[in-house]
């Protein structure tokens, strides 16, 4: 199959998954492409073991994660359902501020420097943290 | 010796199409993103077209967006572009190139020698 | 799309001489800029990616540096080998897009 049995170089395993942090920074959407050119999607941060996992390799920094807005309800890149799944947003976030003078509101998602998230404005070019899963093939239930 | 070879180019009318071919080899081919690039008769580089290493992700530019496709046969070490509704503005020498990586950027490390492309009735 | 201005459209020069290449980004890009070379009937050569890192194999008289949205090549001492022409491209940003091209040429 086609499915990925180890990480590439200079991306960090971690629960069966692969992790590429940035050292630059690019807007919400750039990120995003560089992701997907890569064959992986920006971070989706699925639990609280996780979220410590990429707190830790990130630091103190503003940094993209695969969850926006901009069509409306959030939304994980992947699919992964919003309103049941893990969260971690700073108090009275998110608030679609619209005071920042850049025009519209926020609607992309960043870990902030203590980790938890915020939503911000889209073009802001901060670092990002790539993310593809090992053995995705070969994790689908067998063909009945 | 890493390799690209493209293929397919020559005379088509306004309105026809045509599939370039890209044969790699002296590396891993599915492990790195393609690209098609190309340069009209004493003009500039003009990218076209990406493609991710398994081939799930592609990008385009605008001035070819509907008309053209990047695809891949990693079994075969092949990058293809088929181009449709070709207009006379499409003449040029298109280049296939291999996207290096190096810690977090990858430049068009290793490129064709082109195939050229004429479209005129 | 990111606009990449790039001067002089060419240049004469002597062996020997240094000579620099300039690109302009319209809009931030960090350092997400090539430059290659580019020769009649040749396959096109990178030179530098990252704005100021060397492509292995490539003489060290080819140098990049960056400044904000301005970003240099130079060629520290011309050598006949180096007159063809050159083009910056930024990868910030899809569509990815090249300057112009700078033509060297033996005064």
């Known amino acids: 199959g086609s499915e990925r049995t180890c990480c590439p170089v200079n991306w960090v395993e971690h629960e069966r998954s692969c992790y590429w942090f940035s050292r630059s920074g690019k807007a919400w959407a750039d990120a995003d492409n560089y992701c997907r050119l890569e064959d992986a999607h920006l971070v989706v941060v699925t639990s609280w073991e996780e979220q410590k996992f990429v707190q830790h390799h990130i630091g103190p920094v503003n940094t993209w994660m695969g969850l926006h807005d901009q069509n409306g309800p959030w939304k994980w890149v992947d699919g992964t359902d919003y309103e049941t799944g893990f969260k971690n947003w700073r108090p009275e976030q998110p608030d679609d501020w619209y005071g920042h003078g850049l025009g519209g509101g926020e609607d992309c998602a960043h870990f902030t420097d203590d980790g938890r998230w915020n939503d911000d404005v889209c073009q802001r070019p901060y670092r990002w943290v790539c993310e593809t899963e090992l053995d995705k093939a070969s994790q689908e239930p067998p063909l009945l | 010796e890493v390799q690209l070879l493209e293929s397919g180019g020559g005379l088509v009318q306004p309105g026809g199409s045509l599939r370039l071919s890209c044969a790699a080899s002296?590396?891993?081919?599915?492990?790195?993103?393609m690209t098609w690039v190309r340069q009209a008769p004493g003009k500039g580089l003009e990218w076209v077209s990406a493609i991710s290493g398994s081939g799930g992700n592609t990008f385009y530019a605008d001035s070819v967006t509907g008309r053209v496709t990047i695809s891949r046969d990693n079994s075969k070490n092949t990058l293809y572009l088929q181009m449709n509704s070709l207009r006379a503005e499409d003449t040029a020498v298109y280049y296939c190139a291999k996207l290096g990586k190096d810690y977090h950027y990858y430049g068009m490390d290793v490129w064709g020698q082109g195939t050229t492309v004429t479209v005129s009735s | 799309d990111i606009q990449m201005t790039q001067s002089p459209s060419s240049v004469s020069a002597s062996v020997g001489d240094r000579v620099t290449i300039t690109c302009r980004a319209s809009?931030?890009?960090s350092n997400w800029l090539a430059w290659y070379q580019l020769k009649p009937g040749k396959a096109p050569k990178l030179?530098?990616?990252?704005?100021?890192s060397l492509q292995s194999g490539v003489p060290s008289r080819f140098s990049g540096n960056e400044s904000g949205t301005d970003f240099t090549l130079t060629i520290s001492s011309l050598q006949p080998e180096d007159f063809a022409t050159y083009y910056c491209?930024?990868?910030?940003?899809?569509?990815?897009?090249f300057g112009q091209g700078t033509k060297v040429e033996i005064k």
């Open positions: 491209q930024q990868a910030n940003s899809f569509p990815w897009t």
């Open positions: 002296g590396f891993t081919f599915s492990n790195y993103a």
């Open positions: 030179l530098i990616y990252t704005a100021s």
């Open positions: 809009q931030v890009i």
